[in-house]
């Protein structure tokens, strides 16, 4: 059993350690910004292709708050959502609704989180309690991974890939309220 | 399946000091925060501090402050627990724990047993 | 440090009872608790946090509510793996502070 995910109010879903969380079916956030990546070297053939790096799927990049009870984070994070169908990656379109997808007859490709890193966040809550931290496991990079028949779907989550180390460098130090802490000014997060 | 795994029962004199690991799998030990607890026996439950293994951040119960110290070997997954000048009320089981918040206590180790006695 | 008090310390109840323990903090705590269960010679497990937020995996028969000072656990419909002890703790001031524990013991 890993940390879970769960949503809030805003229904939003929050990842936490352990557990990866599904691309949510539509993004409406005007900071997602589109890209193609993970591009590797074009198939000589697109039915012959058998090396799952010669395939490439989408990462979107969104940003979004972090909350925990009535807790909200300081700053938003930035994480991906991997997106869409795997194609060969020079027939990738440039942008969603564009050009038309490349489907394989045979296995099924799918873009599937890849890597993960964990981001300590400073967390404001309401009532004056002093600023306490949180770890958000997020979503690095996306890979396409090839599935057979033999596959189901929790295979996806993919549990066995490490973590991209988070960046470096001190990070506020959360202290639980307390007269000191009462004066302490709020930090930003990283 | 994530898992906390301590280090065997000590036996220590009083003055002395102890050291107790705890092995984390199922994720980086630098992903969580990590927590330690202890319990006297037939006694209830009494936090000690947590550390931040990803940047030794640490916060420490100031009952503790300066006895102990908490480290954190994220090459191995391990947290550390060292509590010096041991006295005999210091008996108890010291737990470690885990969690995603710095201030709740997602998965527990099972607890390693600590007797200080002359 | 904020002293956080459990009633009753134990109670004697029988499968399918349903179980109140309350928990009164000595001062404003918000919904910074959590509850753990324990059996003996185990470590704790954590049940509830945010006062009223199940942790993963824990049944629905366990419910939590409350805010600012009072507190309490409910088990809707008592199991036998119930039988155990339950402390609160709370996160809301250093250094985090647990209850004295609540007993549930067969009847």
């Known amino acids: 059993q890993g940390w879970q995910a769960f949503k809030n109010d805003a229904t939003e879903i929050i990842p936490e350690l352990g557990e990866y969380p599904e691309p949510p079916p539509e993004l409406e956030n005007n900071k997602t910004m589109n890209r193609a990546e993970n591009g590797g070297r074009p198939p000589h053939h697109p039915f012959e292709t058998k090396d799952v790096s010669e395939y490439s799927c989408r990462e979107l990049h969104f940003t979004r708050y972090v909350t925990d009870g009535p807790c909200r984070s300081a700053k938003p994070v930035t994480e991906l959502v991997c997106s869409g169908q795997c194609g060969p990656a020079r027939l990738l379109p440039n942008a969603i609704g564009r050009g038309k997808w490349w489907r394989p007859s045979g296995p099924d490709f799918r873009c599937i989180p890849d890597r993960y890193r964990a981001q300590r966040v400073q967390l404001l809550c309401p009532g004056g309690e002093a600023p306490r931290a949180r770890k958000v496991r997020l979503v690095a990079s996306c890979k396409c991974k090839r599935l057979t028949r033999f596959h189901n779907q929790s295979e996806l989550k993919d549990f066995g890939t490490e973590a991209a180390r988070p960046q470096k460098g001190r990070k506020p130090r959360p202290r639980a309220r307390s007269a000191k802490a009462n004066q302490a000014e709020l930090e930003n997060a990283y | 399946q994530v898992q906390l795994v301590q280090s065997g029962a000590e036996v220590k004199k009083p003055g002395a000091s102890v050291k107790v690991s705890c092995k984390v799998s199922g994720f980086p030990i630098k992903d969580t925060f990590q927590h330690w607890v202890r319990q006297a026996p037939g006694k209830g439950l009494e936090w000690m501090g947590w550390?931040?293994?990803?940047?030794?951040?640490?916060e420490y119960a100031s009952k503790f402050q300066g006895r102990v110290t908490m480290t954190e070997d994220t090459s191995t997954d391990t947290a550390y627990m060292e509590l010096s000048s041991l006295r005999s009320e210091d008996t108890a089981v010291y737990y470690c724990?885990?969690?995603?918040?710095?201030?709740?206590?997602?998965?527990w180790g099972q607890g390693t047993t600590v007797t200080v006695s002359s | 440090d904020i002293q956080m008090t459990q009633s009753p310390s134990s109670l004697s109840a029988s499968v399918g009872d349903r179980v109140t323990i309350t928990c009164r903090a000595s001062q404003d705590i918000h919904t910074y608790l959590a509850w753990y269960q324990q059996k003996p010679g185990k470590a704790p497990k954590l049940l509830i946090y945010w006062a009223s937020t199940r942790w993963s995996g824990v049944p629905s028969r366990f419910s939590g509510s409350g805010s600012g000072t009072d507190f309490t656990l409910t088990i809707s419909s008592l199991q036998p793996e119930d039988f155990a002890t339950y402390y609160c703790?709370?996160?809301?001031?250093?250094?985090?502070?647990f209850g004295g524990g609540t007993k549930v013991e067969i009847k």
């Open positions: 703790q709370q996160g809301d001031t250093l250094p985090y502070t």
């Open positions: 550390s931040d293994p990803e940047i030794g951040d640490t």
């Open positions: 724990a885990t969690g995603d918040t710095t201030y709740k206590f997602d998965f």
